[in-house]
Interface confidence: low
């Protein structure tokens, strides 16, 4: 009901954990020397650590990561015609996260 | 087995849909005139549209949004002692998404 909109619920902290994020597959991951092609798909889902910790001296960091190769299509444009090739991109998924102390930044001298 | 890691599965497109994201509650959302306080929690989960579309002329955009008020704690520091107050922040959740045409930028003349 509309009435339920009126109650401001207590805000819950977004805890430090893995969440699904979108990762854009940039062309330079496939081929740094040539930009005359397209990549399909242009983006994929990855698991990444996010959220916040109890104080500003700690940050949500991955404690375990896994590399995951995926196959994409590299669509080269040659004389205005598409040529379909395959390429492999390695994605990084975060498997576990932890609030870890951040090393204090050195003062700029 | 380790051998299974060598197989590159076909990459699946991260479709345009709502996903859980982390939203940082900045102090200026609570009080623009005074910075001498902390906010708890520092971040919350929101639903946001993300993902990619079939071509670069369309973008994943929210078609329906909802404002959601939540109550946070404003911890003011007065004479080095914390004073706990309540404040309300309005979060915006995306409820539905669509790949929408991006208006072409006019050429710079």
């Amino acid at each position: 009901s509309l009435g339920s909109l009126t109650v401001a619920e207590p805000a819950m902290i977004a805890e430090c954990k893995t969440r699904t994020e979108v990762f854009e597959i940039s062309r330079r991951l496939i081929d740094r020397t040539n930009a005359n092609f397209l990549v399909w798909p242009p983006c994929v889902e990855v698991q990444r650590c996010s959220g916040c910790c109890n104080n500003r001296n700690v940050q949500c960091r991955p404690t375990q990561v896994q590399l995951r190769p995926v196959q994409v299509r590299k669509i080269e444009i040659v004389r205005k015609k598409p040529i379909f090739k395959k390429a492999t991109v390695t994605l990084e998924d975060h498997l576990a996260c932890k609030c870890e102390t951040v090393a204090a930044a050195r003062p700029v001298t | 087995s380790l051998g299974s890691l060598t197989v590159a599965e076909p990459a699946m497109i991260a479709e345009c849909k709502t996903r859980t994201e982390v939203f940082e509650i900045s102090r200026r959302l609570i009080d623009r005139t005074n910075a001498n306080f902390l906010v708890w929690p520092p971040c919350v989960e929101v639903q946001r549209c993300s993902g990619c579309c079939n071509n670069r002329n369309v973008q994943c955009r929210p078609t329906q949004v909802q404002l959601r008020p939540v109550q946070v704690r404003k911890i003011e520091i007065v004479r080095k002692k914390p004073i706990f107050k309540k404040a309300t922040v309005t979060l915006e959740d995306h409820l539905a998404c669509k790949c929408e045409t991006v208006a072409a930028a006019r050429p710079v003349t």
Partner: antibody
């Protein structure tokens, strides 16, 4: 000093199109949500549309949804309102307004407005 | 949509008078209520946000109160420059809506 200057208004026939611009200065444009609000002659204020700081989120009044498009170019400090399929009831002074913090739907600063007249 | 109803639609008052304008929301909007002042031919100016917070630079004779559905704008001692039209606006949920306005005229 915050300054918002609208342009692009004028006389247009029903069914026609106009593109309004709002040039912003005196504040960090890319950090603020922006809105369009209109006022028909002798009438009250009516919210038209709001766009987020990065341009990724937009919201529209039902009366303009599907006909008007709000957009922004943060590199030019400019807000736009593309108005299509204009109707006589769209006749109003259109003002852009700076909409406060990231989730503030209020209007801190306003431009003087630009008059849009829809008539045959 | 949330309807905002302002009363009165107009009033006549003298310099020095205490003026009260009310705004009622069709459903609870917590404290998401803002007040604006508009003079003829000029852009509106934000006076009060979040029901009772005075916008920077606004004279302290202006005050706001209320929460839920009923809100009040009070001018403690009307000054010549205060003759204008006043609008309330809810910023609780889109579509954002304004009250119909209250015109404060010289008696």
């Amino acid at each position: 000093e915050v300054q918002l200057v609208e342009s692009g208004g004028g006389l247009v026939q029903p069914g026609g199109s106009l593109r309004l611009s709002c040039a912003a200065s005196g504040f960090t444009f890319s950090s603020y949500w922006m809105s369009w609000v209109r006022q028909a002659p002798g009438k009250g204020l009516e919210w038209v549309s709001t766009i987020s700081d990065g341009g990724g989120t937009t919201s529209y009044a039902d009366s303009v949804k599907g006909r008007f498009t709000i957009s922004r170019d943060n590199s030019k400090n400019t807000l736009y309102l593309q108005m299509n399929s204009l109707r006589a009831e769209d006749t109003a002074v259109y003002s852009c307004a700076e909409s406060g913090g990231a989730t503030d739907y209020l209007f801190d600063y306003w431009g003087q407005g630009t008059l849009v007249t829809v008539s045959s | 949509d949330i309807q905002m109803t302002q009363s009165p639609s107009s009033l006549s008052a003298s310099v020095g008078d205490r003026v009260t304008i009310t705004c009622r929301a069709s459903q609870s909007i917590s404290s998401y209520l803002n007040w604006y002042q508009q003079k003829p031919g000029k852009a509106p100016k934000l006076l009060i946000y979040a029901a009772s917070s005075l916008q920077s630079g606004v004279p302290s004779r202006f005050s706001g109160s209320g929460s839920g559905t009923d809100f009040t704008l009070t001018i403690s001692s009307l000054q010549p420059e205060d003759f204008a039209t006043y609008y309330c606006q809810q910023s609780y949920i889109t579509p954002l809506t304004f009250g119909g306005g209250t015109k404060v005229e010289i008696k």
